[in-house]
Interface confidence: medium
């Protein structure tokens, strides 16, 4: 075979076996799963249940408001990205249960594991878009009053999705199914044809575009926003801002292990002990990244409870309150100096 990374998205290799050979083949005499795989299965199960139900609820709540409320558009798109990724989980779950055997065919191998990467790129690009929106609301309120509309928000989301699809293509193209021996099984993974440079390039691009660059820009963005909000009176109830910061922070926390192990594996020799250890942890890192797909609804509910007191409202109305609050006050379009100042303060309720 060719240098094959067996697993979910893109890391996790075989050491080779002409076919796909796991760098750490399943013990030939054992039918028991490794501890990291068992933990991954538990996480996958929880993520699937919470992610499908939670994101479906978020989609339902925000879909009605998305025509007129810009925040609803952002949260709707994030939920759709997460929901799509959750749909692949039963397949990935089944594969791990069968010691990474992939009985679902080549097309499924290309598409389903790529969904989490599509989710990663879509999520971070949407978060970047949301963050830009937050930034503009605080620093360019007049521009927002004039131009910030649902149409522009949908265009921004479409661009984010288009770029996400574009960035997922390399993973999609390199995914293949191969045969593994002793005992026989079919594995689904990424085949770089032993081209370490290509593998490293993909890993570096993913790390930079999907993690480091967004981390840097969003950190700067929110530093400015938070400094501004905290420097003003009457800006302490920054509901949407708190939610967005929590969502952004969780994104980086849960993607960190996957990104770190991925970049390390692309630079390590497949026979090295560190590589072998990381390979064993691959499914766990992927499952950890998958937590992103169910964490947002949890954040929304927790935020809603914080803002509403105990659950006095129904879940949908609680979510509606968190997700569809509009940030820009639509008043007169002729501004005096005092109006601008007042508005800058009001828009802190982001």
């Amino acid at each position: 075979m060719n240098s094959f990374n067996y697993t979910t998205p893109d890391y996790g290799h075989y050491d080779d076996k002409d076919t796909l050979d796991l760098n750490t083949p399943v013990d030939k005499t054992s039918n028991t799963l490794r501890v990291p795989d068992i933990l991954a299965l538990v996480i996958f199960a929880v993520v699937f249940l919470v992610g499908v139900l939670g994101n479906a609820l978020v989609v339902w709540v925000t879909a009605f408001e998305a025509k007129r409320t810009i925040n609803a558009i952002w949260f709707l798109n994030l939920a759709v990205a997460d929901f799509l990724s959750c749909l692949a989980l039963p397949i990935l779950f089944t594969s791990i249960v069968q010691h990474h055997h992939w009985p679902f065919g080549g097309a499924a191998c290309s598409i389903l594991p790529s969904l989490i990467l599509l989710n990663m790129y879509a999520s971070i690009l949407l978060l970047a878009t949301i963050s830009a929106d937050r930034f503009l609301l605080v620093f360019k309120p007049i521009w927002c009053q004039n131009f910030r509309g649902a149409g522009l928000a949908w265009i921004a989301c479409a661009v984010a999705w288009g770029l996400a699809l574009l960035l997922t293509i390399p993973s999609f193209l390199y995914r293949v199914v191969r045969e593994e021996y002793f005992p026989p099984k079919v594995l689904c993974g990424v085949d770089y044809s032993h081209d370490k440079r290509r593998e490293r390039a993909v890993a570096i691009v993913r790390l930079v575009l999907g993690f480091l660059w967004p981390l840097l820009t969003l950190t700067i963005c929110y530093t400015f926003i938070l400094l501004r909000t905290w420097s003003r009176r009457a800006t302490r109830s920054t509901k949407t801002l708190k939610v967005v910061v929590a969502v952004v922070a969780s994104f980086f926390i849960f993607w960190l292990p996957y990104q770190v192990t991925g970049i390390m594996m692309s630079f390590l020799e497949p026979s090295s002990p560190t590589f072998l250890l990381l390979n064993k942890l691959d499914s766990l890192c992927v499952s950890f990244a998958y937590i992103n797909c169910c964490i947002n609804p949890i954040i929304y509910v927790v935020a809603g409870q914080g803002f509403q007191g105990r659950l006095r409202k129904s879940l949908p109305s609680l979510l509606r309150n968190v997700l569809t609050e509009e940030s820009v006050v639509r008043e007169s379009k002729s501004f005096t100096r005092s109006t601008v100042d007042t508005m800058a303060q009001k828009t802190q309720a982001v």
């Epitope: 075979m1 002409d18 076919t19 009985p103 191969r178 002793f182 005992p183 026989p184 497949p270």
Partner: antibody
Framework: QVQLKQSGPGLVQSSQSLSITCTVS????????VHWVRQSPGKGLEWLGV???????DYNAAFKSRLSITKDNSKSQVFFKMNSLQADDTAIYYC????????????WGQGTTVTVSS | DIVMSQSPSSLAVSAGEKVTMSCKSS????????????LAWYQQKPGQSPKLLIY???TRESGVPDRFTGSGSGTDFTLTISSVQAEDLALYFC????????FGAGTKLEIK
């Protein structure tokens, strides 16, 4: 076309080691594994081991302690080394390319006839 | 280890006749995951290296004449030569690759 050419000594002293080199052409060692098999009148065909495309190996348990298979991808060479040879190790030794389909061996070397003398 | 048993050990037939040889394994070679039988057949003519004929129990290797047919599943397998030719004089081996690799002792085909 695919070829596997073997080179190594025909005669080995008892308790000494046997080294055979298998030089391949027509395919790349970074994409295909190479098996080693021997054939003796008394025992028929015996699978000895395999080196896979990424460099990992699987060995026949009966030979694991005294067998080593390595390779040099850039030179398209696979190296077979067996230690502590005895008279019953006298056989024809073959290298063969893995087919990737059913783990079969679709191309074989010409064979190296090895006689272990005491 | 999986033990492979071949029968008969030798047989002599006339050109044009149909011949069948058997191969049995000590455990099933059918993978429940891939739904394939990990059994191959090889032909070794006198003074030559073995040549792959059949893999996955019934898939003919490219370039192999269609008079060679592999069949069977699980533990019982058969190689059939529908119309033996003079050039088919050879030793025929079966080989399992389900759990490492082991070979049968071979069936020697002679032409009357």
């Amino acid at each position: 076309q695919v070829q596997l050419k073997q080179s190594g000594p025909g005669l080995v002293q008892s308790s000494q080691s046997l080294s055979i080199t298998c030089t391949v052409s027509g395919f790349s060692l970074i994409s295909y594994g190479v098996h080693w098999v021997r054939q003796s009148p008394g025992k028929g065909l015996e699978w000895l081991g395999v080196i896979w495309s990424g460099g990992s190996t699987d060995y026949n348990a009966a030979f694991k302690s005294r067998l080593s298979i390595t390779k040099d991808n850039s030179k398209s060479q696979v190296f077979f080394k067996m230690n502590s040879l005895q008279a019953d190790d006298t056989a024809i030794y073959y290298c063969a390319k893995n087919s990737q389909l059913g783990n079969a061996m679709d191309y074989w070397g010409q064979g190296t006839t090895v006689t272990v003398s005491s | 280890d999986i033990v492979m048993s071949q029968s008969p050990s030798s047989l002599a037939v006339s050109a044009g006749e149909k011949v069948t040889m058997s191969c049995k394994s000590s455990q099933s070679l059918l993978s429940s995951r891939t739904r394939k039988n990990y059994l191959a057949w090889y032909q070794q003519k006198p003074g030559q290296s073995p040549k792959l004929l059949i893999y996955w129990a019934s898939t003919r290797e490219s370039g192999v004449p269609d008079r060679f047919t592999g069949s069977g599943s699980g533990t019982d397998f058969t190689l059939t030569i529908s119309s033996v030719q003079a050039e088919d004089l050879a030793l025929y081996f079966c080989n399992q690759s389900y759990d490492l690799l082991t070979f049968g002792a071979g069936t020697k085909l002679e032409i009357k």
